[in-house]
């Protein structure tokens, strides 16, 4: 058993049929010694008396808010949560496996630049009685500070018969140098509590590996005389690290119709303009990627050919 | 920026082309190592990230773009010594910091060159003959060092009398290649920045 936060405790249980469970001793936070009784949640049934209460925690029915009273007055609370371990593996029932970039990916993180600011998100099908708490640091043995905000519900989607909820959190490394060469990864820890179930999820990464620039901005087309070619130009996204001659991007320019199966014109360039062949009912799209360290491509920025 | 802005032109700043080749060569070598040593811990997640130049050179700090010198977090350990010879220097207006930056890059390359050559000598003794260093990568390191043209003491190649542990050598190779790739990225950024200046 360990303390998650004041008056909230996590009991770690090996979860299998007829498991013996865990013996837990609760102590009432009071100077009083006599006349103390214990109840669980809203029930008025007295579970025991005395300053301490010993319980055998085996299942979710044994978890919950234990309260000690004296003469009708509440003295203190202890909330017990369960953390299940099945076949030596901690349960991951609360969050959905996003399977990208690999299986057992529950947390996904991205950074728009090298400033030390990043966003992580996760998915769940649970809509109520759900809380998240996020901590982060650079390295684990001698951790350096990363400050994370509160996790918020950022999107709701319907997937078949199920509703899916996306939560996200923004974090900022306290003292980040965009030009630094990372040798210790960022660690992100998410505590998830659904009703009386506790789970924790972690992710470890280097900012350089989670870079995904915003799409290029201000796409413009200029038809070339006596030709089917157009010159397309664009600018670096505002959110990208500066100076751009140090933090350079490379670009992919593509002309394609509405269907992915349609024919296309595609060219890669380090410049902020390119010449392509435009077709009726097609659009020109441009995306960006760090020129020197190949992490993710940005989403496409598009303009119609016409 | 205190350096005049000019149109980027590979001919104007000879080291840019070499640094691009360097990044390409080390990336290819790392990819080859990851494929060949698939049953060894050779991915970014599996290895310890060590920097053999730590406390010996200060490339990141010495080569910091002027725009980032206002960022407190980037200024932990700025060096103040400088060296002013070097053929990549594009004009007489070149600042001392730029000379220090290029000499720091040169020292990095020299250190990695020695490590890689020592390691290759060990790998050549491996009866499995599983992996060797790409001669192209070693040549590209040499070309960039020649383009930088700094005079410095030659570092003797380390020779070891004991029987090499090939498993450890291959893991060390992965560690070295990962670190060198990161440094090659920095070098490429720096050359691109200087080329635009």
């Amino acid at each position: 058993i360990w303390e998650l936060k004041k008056d909230v405790y996590v009991v770690e249980l090996d979860w299998y049929p007829d498991a013996p469970g865990e013996m837990v001793v609760l102590t009432c936070d009071t100077p009083e010694e006599d006349g103390i009784t214990w109840t669980l949640d809203q029930s008025s049934e007295v579970l025991g008396s005395g300053k301490t209460l010993t319980i055998q925690v085996k299942e979710f029915g044994d978890a919950g808010q234990y309260t000690c009273h004296k003469g009708g007055e509440v003295l203190s609370h202890s909330l017990l949560l369960l953390h299940k371990k099945e076949d030596g593996i901690w349960s991951t029932d609360i969050l959905k496996d996003q399977k990208e970039p690999k299986n057992k990916t529950f947390l996904r993180c991205e950074a728009k630049n090298y400033s030390g600011r990043f966003t992580c998100w996760w998915l769940t099908t649970i809509s109520t009685d759900l809380t998240f708490s996020v901590k982060s640091s650079r390295g684990s043995s001698d951790p350096q500070g990363v400050t994370c905000g509160a996790a918020t519900l950022s999107a709701e989607r319907v997937r078949g018969d199920n509703k899916e909820y996306e939560y996200s959190v923004e974090c900022q490394e306290d003292s980040a140098c965009p030009a630094a060469e990372e040798s210790l990864p960022i660690e992100v820890m998410v505590d998830a509590v659904h009703k009386l179930k506790y789970e924790n999820y972690t992710s470890s990464f280097f900012i350089r590996d989670i870079i995904k620039p915003d799409p290029p901005k201000n796409l413009q087309l200029k038809p070339l005389k006596n030709s089917r070619q157009v010159e397309v130009s664009w600018e670096y996204p505002d959110t990208w690290s500066t100076p751009h001659s140090y933090f350079s991007l490379t670009f992919c320019v593509q002309v394609q119709g509405k269907s992915k199966r349609e024919k296309k014109d595609r060219v890669f360039t380090d410049k902020t303009s390119a010449t392509v062949i435009c077709r009726k009912n097609a659009s020109i799209s441009v995306r960006a990627q760090d020129r020197y360290y190949s992490s993710s491509w940005s989403e496409w920025a598009s303009v119609p050919c016409s | 920026r205190n350096l005049p802005v000019a149109t980027p032109d590979p001919g104007m700043f000879p080291c840019l082309h070499h640094s691009q080749n360097l990044l390409r060569a080390v990336s290819n070598m790392l990819q080859k190592a990851r494929q060949t040593l698939e049953f060894y811990p050779c991915t970014s997640e599996e290895i310890d990230h060590e920097d053999i130049t730590k406390d010996k050179t200060s490339t990141v700090e010495a080569c910091l773009p002027l725009e980032l010198t206002k960022n407190e977090s980037c200024l932990n350990s700025r060096e103040t010594s400088f060296i002013t010879n070097g053929s990549c220097l594009a004009s007489r207006k070149t600042s001392f910091m730029m000379a220090l930056c290029l000499s720091s890059i040169y020292e990095d390359l020299k250190m990695y060159q020695v490590e890689f050559k020592t390691m290759n000598a060990k790998l050549l003794m491996d009866p499995k003959r599983q992996i060797f260093l790409d001669q192209n990568m070693l040549a590209v390191i040499d070309e960039l060092m020649q383009a930088l043209n700094f005079n410095s003491e030659t570092v003797p190649q380390k020779s070891s009398l004991e029987e090499p542990d090939f498993y450890k050598t291959k893991i060390k190779l992965c560690i070295l290649l990962h670190a060198f790739r990161i440094r090659a990225v920095t070098i490429d950024r720096v050359m691109s920045y200087l080329n635009a200046s």
Epitope: Q229, K264, F268, D270, I277 | -
Partner: antibody, heavy 118, light 107 residues
Framework: QVQLVQSGAEVKKPGSSVKVSCKAS????????LHWVRQAPGQGLEWMGW????????EYAPKFQGRVTITADESTSTAYMELSSLRSEDTAVYYC???????????WGQGTLVTVSS | DIVMTQSPLSLPVTPGEPASISCRAS??????LHWYQQKPGQAPRLLIA???QSISGVPSRFSGSGSGTDFTLTISSLQPEDFATYYC?????????FGQGTKVEIK
Amino acid sequence: QVQLVQSGAEVKKPGSSVKVSCKASGGTFSDYYLHWVRQAPGQGLEWMGWIDPENGDTEYAPKFQGRVTITADESTSTAYMELSSLRSEDTAVYYCARNKELRYFDVWGQGTLVTVSS
Amino acid sequence: DIVMTQSPLSLPVTPGEPASISCRASQSISINLHWYQQKPGQAPRLLIAFASQSISGVPSRFSGSGSGTDFTLTISSLQPEDFATYYCQQSNSFPLTFGQGTKVEIK
């Protein structure tokens, strides 16, 4: 299986024209760009131009501009390359090639040898 | 026009040994570079697109690298069927242009 089948070898007199055909099978004809590339005996490859069979748009290499015409007939899934004012240096194998990507070629015809000789 | 220069023009290799062919562009072409193999009396065959993207059906011993002006096609271990002429082609701008070809021959 996508295939491009070209017309047979031709012998032409200098100053005359030649029209080579390229019939496509497998896949929708208008879903691909179609190019013509030639190769003189013992020499390298030389790109001549492309056509978008969907709308008849064409683009030619400056070297052949005014002398080459590329057309396409969607009803028969056939593309044509006509080269006029032939000279001896036009003796070559002419290939048609296609791709959904405009700028490179993933399927090639077997080639048509055009000999220009007096 | 962008001029593509291949080297060497002839490359004698022992079967089973690796081979590398170089292609240089007269100006920067990013990764807009493709490689083809041509055997005598046959049409060219696409091996690599955009400098390093493998093509389905092409053996994994063929790999490409490079960007900007310098590109390399590598055959990790030459098989008897790999003796052929190899061409690079730039797609950065029209007109599309090819290298003059490298003939890989049995040593």
